[in-house]
């Protein structure tokens, strides 16, 4: 069964900067990736970036840089201030589509250990969810 992994990291050097990394563990080729965010339990969500292998990348504030890392993984840098700044209980979701096989989503949030005064772990364990 295909799976999606998500890592969320707060940058130690810029406390309002977050990096989201997502990847697809499956055999199909990726036709589209959508990154979204919102409150816990599905509250108040919106799209941050859409990545299409042929048609390009679209991103919306506070997303600063979305890019492909490999053919099956992406990264997204968020820079927030004020109302658009992510907080500790913000949920980030990545949905990978592999046409025509299907699509899969996983969500994650900042690890509890990522106190603003502490350095986030360099390689947080992936958060997996396969529906």
């Amino acid at each position: 069964t295909p799976e999606v992994w998500v890592q969320v990291r707060m940058e130690a050097t810029e406390l309002s900067s977050f990096t989201i990394r997502c990847g697809f563990l499956g055999s199909g080729s990726i036709s589209l990736v959508t990154v979204s965010w919102g409150g816990p339990n599905g509250a108040g969500g919106t799209t941050l970036a859409v990545l299409h292998p042929e048609r390009g990348i679209r991103q919306w504030a506070p997303a600063r840089q979305a890019r492909w890392e490999t053919q099956s993984s992406i990264s997204l840098i968020l820079e927030g201030s004020g109302a658009s700044s992510p907080c500790a209980n913000t949920t980030f979701c990545c949905k990978f589509a592999s046409f025509p096989e299907g699509s899969w989503e996983a969500c994650g949030s900042l690890p509890p250990s990522s106190d603003p005064g502490l350095s986030a772990p360099p390689t947080p364990a992936p958060i997996l969810r396969a529906d």
Epitope: L32, G42, A43, G44, G45, V50, G56, A97, S103
Partner: nanobody
């Protein structure tokens, strides 16, 4: 795995009404924009309507404005398309999809340009 399941299609006379539903599961439905697209027999895929994640913003192709209404119920993970004053040219397979096709343009639209897609429901408008 994400699932989008459309229902509500069928045979209707010109001037009649139908309400399509799309039940979503396997993803955080309330975080995503949703759209309806359609494919008439022998034609390409056509965008019909889009609604944003909280339902506060909608858009429609000119040919259905004033006749079709898109809506969503995030508490039920369901997308709707109310179709009134149906015409023969509305005959098509209607697909529920995740995403807004305007992100990359409406030219040469394909189901692979969306984040998720359903199996489609057939709407036939004929007397």
């Amino acid at each position: 795995e994400v699932q989008l399941v459309e229902s509500g299609g069928g045979l209707v006379q010109p001037g009649g009404s139908l309400r399509l539903s799309c039940a979503a599961s396997g993803f955080t439905f309330s975080y995503y924009d949703m759209s309806w697209v359609r494919q008439a027999p022998g034609k390409g895929l056509e965008w019909v309507s889009t609604i944003n994640s909280n339902g506060g913003r909608t858009s429609y192709v000119d040919s259905v404005k004033g006749r079709f209404t898109i809506s969503r119920d995030n508490s039920k993970n369901t997308l709707y398309l109310q179709m009134n004053s149906l015409r023969a040219e509305d005959t098509a397979v209607y697909y529920c999809v995740e995403g807004d096709p305007h992100n990359f343009g409406l030219e040469s639209l394909s189901l692979r340009d969306f984040g998720s897609w359903g199996q489609g429901t057939m709407v036939t408008v004929s007397s």
